[in-house]
């Protein structure tokens, strides 16, 4: 069966029907590049005016305008608010009332696209494997990133959160139109990773999405993550304004000037420092969501009533902090270099500025307790990674899970830890799952490109797709179309239950109280320490901002790591970059 032309609020759209085997039978309808909104520079998105005739939705559209990896050029374009849909089809009748999974990509709110990293037309966020294996509709889309998506003066002149509003527009479009593609508009799951995971969290907290979202999955990121909310947007807006020659004293004049500035100049006016700075790298993530009093009406911790009826899965990778540790403490990955106590203390104090000297000392003390018995470099480096993982991912996720559970009415809560080790050959032997390592498994790469993977990788991928799509279907990761390796029990406040995702998932994979000692430290001991005066949110941007980022590790989820020859705008964008 195939859909043919589909009538949407914008007009007719036609995709392609891809047969899943030479013998016919099952297939997938794929629609690429359906417009869901339009937007002017630094303004809220608006409804797309639509089209006449039948839109041929057969190619991905360019990503939203963003800096290249080297940060010395841009790619993508401003006209970028398009979405992509994968609809699994059986032999006879077209699909009807399928669960819908809407993906929000990560990339530090600075980069990324709905199709993801691309090698030879093999896109990281290709929804086909999830759609066909889980019998769900998958939707991916672009949203504005960087200054164009998140620049804010902290007032009504430039409220910011444009990228979040783009995401909302996409979710609302899906709600209004997905029935025509065979989807159930009352069963929408949003899921995302890193900045996309924090975005998922923020969308569930925003009153704008009331009634739109049934379930949510956050992979390595939460609204409560320290890198997810910008507390001092005006500082960074002024930094950009100075660079592009706009006035900075009056926010109205500044906003008016910024809106008519070349969007490429705005994009290139900001560079994320990738060499070691005075503070940890996440502090330099300038253009991220803000509490605008509207889309995000209050501090996220106060908005959990809005998630009372939204089922939630949230989890992290067991070494999510590794990517950031390698920037903040470069010796972590270098076998011939040593991490010193001073290195670690500097890192700790950079993450505990709000609590001053006492906060830094208390944190340093608890994290270095094991160093007396085991002063090896391996242990010290693991501590650095564990600390970054805790601060940036684990603690915010645990707090969010507890908040979700405490405010739940009909909602169910599930927690996981992804522990399948990274396949990066250059990493230390002790390495676990790095930030973004989970993506290839959720998107079924071990099946799509089998030569690059082992049977154990396929087992991980199969399990994750089964749990994820069952959850989208029923709100329970155990119940749905796909068998699962073991029962995943819901998270409880008493036990802190979580599923440890490894190559062999058994009943022993259900665990409790992840890093309880450290969670208690952050939630109790650290929390009660007095906050020091002074504005710890105001950071000095790096002196030399002309430096370019080195090439990050390439995405090893494909077997042929060759840049595409067909489409320069989709040059390789490693999945391993991206918060």
């Amino acid at each position: 069966a195939k859909l043919g032309a589909v009538y949407t609020e914008g007009g007719f759209v036609e995709g392609v029907n891809k047969k899943l085997s030479l013998l016919g039978g099952d297939s997938v309808d794929i629609f690429k590049g359906i417009p869901f909104a339009t937007a002017k520079t630094l303004e809220n998105p608006q409804r797309h005016p639509g089209w006449q005739g039948t839109l041929k939705a057969t190619n991905f559209k360019k990503r939203c305008l963003q800096a290249t990896i080297t940060q010395d050029n841009t790619y993508g374009q401003e006209d970028c608010l398009y979405l992509n849909i994968w609809v699994p089809q059986g032999r006879k009748q077209v699909s009807h009332n399928l669960p819908v999974m809407v993906w929000i990509y990560g990339g530090a709110f600075l980069m990324g696209s709905g199709q993801g990293a691309n090698f030879l037309k093999n896109y990281l966020y290709d929804g086909e494997e999830i759609a066909t294996r889980g019998n769900v509709i998958v939707v991916t889309f672009n949203y504005r990133v960087g200054p164009l998506g998140f620049l804010s003066t902290g007032d009504a002149n430039l409220p910011g959160n444009f990228g979040l509003r783009d995401q909302h527009m996409a979710i609302a479009w899906v709600k209004r139109n997905i029935a025509a593609f065979g989807g159930d508009p009352d069963n929408i799951t949003i899921f995302g990773e890193s900045a996309g995971a924090a975005s998922v969290s923020l969308q569930t907290l925003s009153p704008y999405n009331k009634g739109l979202i049934r379930r949510a999955i956050s992979q390595s990121g939460m609204a409560l993550s320290p890198w997810a909310i910008q507390k001092n947007p005006l500082f960074w807006a002024k930094t950009i304004a100075k660079k592009v020659g706009c006035p900075t004293e009056d926010t109205g004049k500044m906003a008016a000037c910024l809106k008519i500035t070349d969007p490429r100049a705005l994009t290139l006016a900001y560079k994320l420092p990738v060499k070691k700075q005075e503070y940890p790298v996440v502090h330099y993530l300038a253009f991220i969501p803000v509490i605008d009093g509207d889309f995000i009406p209050d501090d996220p911790i106060n908005l959990y009533n809005n998630t009372a009826d939204i089922d939630y899965i949230a989890g992290i990778n067991n070494m999510d902090g590794h990517l950031f540790a390698t920037i903040d403490v470069p010796a972590v990955d270098k076998t011939k270099q040593t991490v010193t106590e001073e290195d670690f203390y500097r890192l700790v104090s950079g993450h505990t500025v709000a609590k001053g000297l006492k906060g830094a000392q208390a944190t340093f003390d608890i994290y270095t307790e094991s160093w007396a018995q085991d002063p090896s470099q391996e242990n010290m480096k693991k501590t650095v990674v564990a600390f970054e993982t805790d601060v940036l991912f684990l603690i915010p996720t645990e707090i969010a899970l507890a908040q979700h559970k405490a405010h739940a009415k009909s909602a169910k809560t599930y927690s996981y830890l992804f522990s399948h080790p990274s396949r990066m050959p250059i990493y230390p032997k002790w390495m676990g799952a790095d930030h973004a390592d989970d993506l290839q498994y959720v998107f079924g790469k071990p099946f799509a490109t089998p030569l690059g993977y082992r049977p154990q990788d396929r087992a991980v991928s199969k399990a994750m797709i089964a749990y994820w799509t069952n959850f989208a279907r029923s709100g329970d990761p155990n119940m749905g179309n796909s068998p699962v390796p073991t029962h995943w029990y819901p998270y409880t406040l008493e036990n802190g239950n979580y599923l440890d995702i490894t190559k062999t998932i058994t009943s022993a994979s259900m665990k409790e109280h992840l890093r309880e000692k450290f969670l208690k430290f952050w939630a109790v001991t650290f929390e009660v320490l007095p906050t020091v005066t002074g504005d710890q949110d105001t950071l000095t941007p790096p002196e030399d901002d002309s430096e370019v980022a080195p090439d990050p590790p390439s995405d090893d989820s494909q077997v042929v790591p060759v840049p595409p020859t067909d489409d320069s705008v989709e040059a390789q964008m490693p999945a391993t970059i991206g918060f």
Epitope: Y7, G53, R176
Partner: antibody, heavy 119, light 105 residues
């Protein structure tokens, strides 16, 4: 100027089919979607479906799925709406209506065709 | 499908009165359109995209609203305004409100 001229009134028996035509002029026929809307006596407006005259793509309201067929003839700039298995509750005025722009409202309407279903 | 609830279903008013008709969608929609229909005639587009006035329509007609709640306002009723008014949402499955019949008091 845009004009949509519909065929005349019809009286049909239950179980029969009816085919109503709508001839368009004053614009490029293949450039705008054509919708069909009906109105039972003393009742409100009900959307039946839409056709893209350019490629013949159609979409029908769930209620009419399997009973309605919309076609077009580009040589005469005419669209047709055929409704089968008629019942008394199909008695209504049937309108063709053209899109105003993009994903827009229905900006131009035919004069309507009364279809009466009676035994 | 998105359901449209129009209110009131009928309304008596006098020439010169200010009249408001509301339409509520069962879930959030992009834009609302409004039509006027007189007996024996086809509907006529008045307001499109919630608030844009169709050319040739008098400025006493105005529209507002977003999300699920929309309003059609006639600032000062004229004799020719007595008719039935319909709201219309344009999604993948378009629907109309049940209509508001505006009668002379």
């Amino acid at each position: 100027q845009v004009q949509l001229v519909q065929s005349g009134a019809e009286v049909k028996k239950p179980g029969a089919s009816v085919k109503v035509s709508c001839k368009a002029s004053g614009y490029t026929f293949t450039s705008y979607n054509m919708h069909w809307v009906r109105q039972a006596p003393g009742q409100g407006l009900e959307w039946i479906g839409v056709i893209n005259p350019g490629d013949g793509a159609t979409s029908y309201a769930q209620k009419f799925q399997g009973r309605v067929t919309m076609t077009r003839d580009t040589s005469t700039s005419t669209v047709y709406m055929e409704l089968s298995s008629l019942r008394s509750e199909d008695t209504a005025v049937y309108y063709c209506a053209r899109d105003y722009y993009g994903s827009s409202p229905l900006g131009y309407w035919g004069q309507g065709t009364l279809v009466t279903v009676s035994s | 499908d998105i359901q449209m609830t129009q209110s009131p279903s009928s309304l008596s008013a006098s020439v010169g009165d200010r009249v408001t008709i509301t339409c509520r969608a069962s879930s959030s929609i992009s834009y609302m359109h409004w039509y006027q229909q007189k007996p024996g005639k086809a509907p006529k587009l008045l307001i499109y995209a919630a608030s844009s006035l169709q050319s040739g329509v008098p400025s006493r007609f105005s529209g507002s609203g977003s999300g699920t709640d929309f309003t059609l306002t006639i600032s000062s009723l004229q004799p020719e305004d007595f008719a039935t008014y319909y709201c219309h949402q344009r999604s993948s499955s378009p629907t109309f409100g049940q209509g508001t019949k505006l009668e002379i008091k």
